[in-house]
Interface confidence: medium
């Protein structure tokens, strides 16, 4: 039934980009400016996203294809598809309601976005601290004490996990 | 009401290093970020970098080793610092506030005037 | 860096008349323009941003458009207290850039 009813309608053979136009004979109309359709079959472009004020644009819309948008400089997107931008902190720092405030003892953020996050606890894995934290860093975790027995040999220290970075400035 | 003021020596020598405070009042430097731009004498606008809200700051790459930015935002201060200074940093200095919807200044210091001389 | 550049660098006008300022981005910078108009002897204040968005109170004869690369500034119908220095300012990435500027003066 579904394939009769697609082969009957002449709006499915409208491709992404274009429109099906019941104003002429639904003819497959190309999207107007500033609109786009990224699935085929559709009556209506969507308009495109506009990437004003604090925001700017990161790709520009296309006839298939919505514009995306990322932060001007000295913000950081928010949410999904950058809703939202919030201006950036200090690496050590994470946003509060009254401002950037300094990451308390035992956590860090090595990031201008985001909390600050606790310190690896490098005892949970038997290892010692080769670094100690602050608070734009984490630790560095070393071998367990029992590794460094004479004779034993030397381990490289793995390098902190990082989170992926904000939308690039 | 938003204001900014800039205060500085007004004649520096060359090689020193320049200090000018800007003094904000009807907005908190909690919130906002505040730019600094100078202008020679009948010449046009320069951007000489910004203090964002949480301290971070941005400087124009033409002069990041000699711009310091910090402020005190308990004073509702921010200090601008240029070092090794030559004729041509004879400028008027503006502080400028940047407002949360662009990366822009909307309201301005009546600037100071800066002369390098020796 | 991002060049501004705008033209003329001068212009002369009538009270009433419509005026066009240019500017030029060396590359794509979206919307992220604004404008400034600065008096001698004054600071530049705030006009427009986001290439079209007037800033609070300034009047509705100043339009801004434009998009992409090439920007205008207009003012649909001069007023004597118009005649000043106007600039334009890209925020699209680092370092912040201005126009050189476009004195606007009586004929």
């Known amino acids: 039934f579904e394939r009769t009813r697609s082969l009957q309608d002449p709006c499915s053979n409208c491709p992404a980009g274009t429109f099906c136009d019941n104003n002429r004979n639904q003819i497959c109309s190309p999207c107007p400016p500033n609109s786009f359709s990224s699935a085929g079959g559709q009556r209506t472009c969507d308009i495109c996203r506009q990437c004003k004020g604090v925001f700017r644009t990161r790709k520009e819309c296309s006839s298939t294809s919505n514009a995306e948008c990322d932060c001007t400089p000295g913000f950081h997107c928010l949410g999904a598809g950058c809703s939202m931008c919030e201006q950036d902190c200090k690496q050590g720092q994470e946003l509060t309601k009254k401002g950037c405030k300094d990451c308390c003892f035992g956590t860090f953020n090595d990031q201008k976005r985001g909390i600050c996050r606790p310190w690896t606890n490098c005892s949970l894995d038997g290892k010692s601290v080769l670094v100690n934290g602050t608070k734009e860093r984490d630790v560095v975790c070393g071998p367990s004490p029992a590794d460094l027995s004479p004779g034993a040999s030397s381990v490289t220290p793995p390098a902190p996990a990082r989170e992926p970075g904000h939308s690039p400035q | 009401q938003v204001q900014l003021q800039e205060s500085g020596p007004g004649l520096v020598k060359p090689s020193e290093t320049l200090s000018i405070t800007c003094t904000v009042s009807?907005?908190?430097?909690?919130?906002?970020?505040v730019h600094w731009v100078r202008q020679p004498p009948g010449k046009g606008l320069e951007w000489l970098g910004v203090i964002w809200s949480g301290g971070s700051t941005d400087y124009n790459p033409s002069l990041k080793s000699r711009v310091t930015i910090s402020k005190d935002t308990s004073k509702n201060q921010v200090s601008f610092k240029l070092s090794s200074l030559t004729a041509a940093d004879t400028a008027i200095y503006y502080c400028?506030?940047?407002?949360?919807?662009?990366?822009?200044?909307?309201?301005w210091g009546q600037g100071t005037l800066v002369t390098v001389s020796s | 860096d991002i060049q501004m550049t705008q033209s003329p660098s001068s212009l002369s006008a009538s009270v009433g008349d419509r005026v066009t300022v240019t500017c030029r981005a060396s590359?794509?910078?979206?919307?992220?323009v604004a404008w400034y108009q600065q008096k001698p002897g004054k600071a530049p204040k705030a006009l427009i941003y986001s290439a079209s968005y007037r800033d609070s109170g300034v009047p509705s004869r100043f339009s801004g458009s434009g998009s992409g690369t090439d920007f205008t500034l207009t003012i649909s119908s001069v007023q004597p207290e118009d005649f000043a220095t106007y600039y334009c300012?890209?925020?699209?990435?680092?370092?912040?850039?201005f126009g050189g500027g476009t004195k606007l003066e009586i004929k």
């Open positions: 400028a506030r940047n407002p949360l919807t662009a990366t822009v200044m909307d309201y």
């Open positions: 300012q890209q925020y699209n990435s680092y370092p912040l850039t």
């Open positions: 009807g907005f908190s430097l909690i919130s906002y970020g």
């Open positions: 590359q794509n910078v979206g919307t992220n």
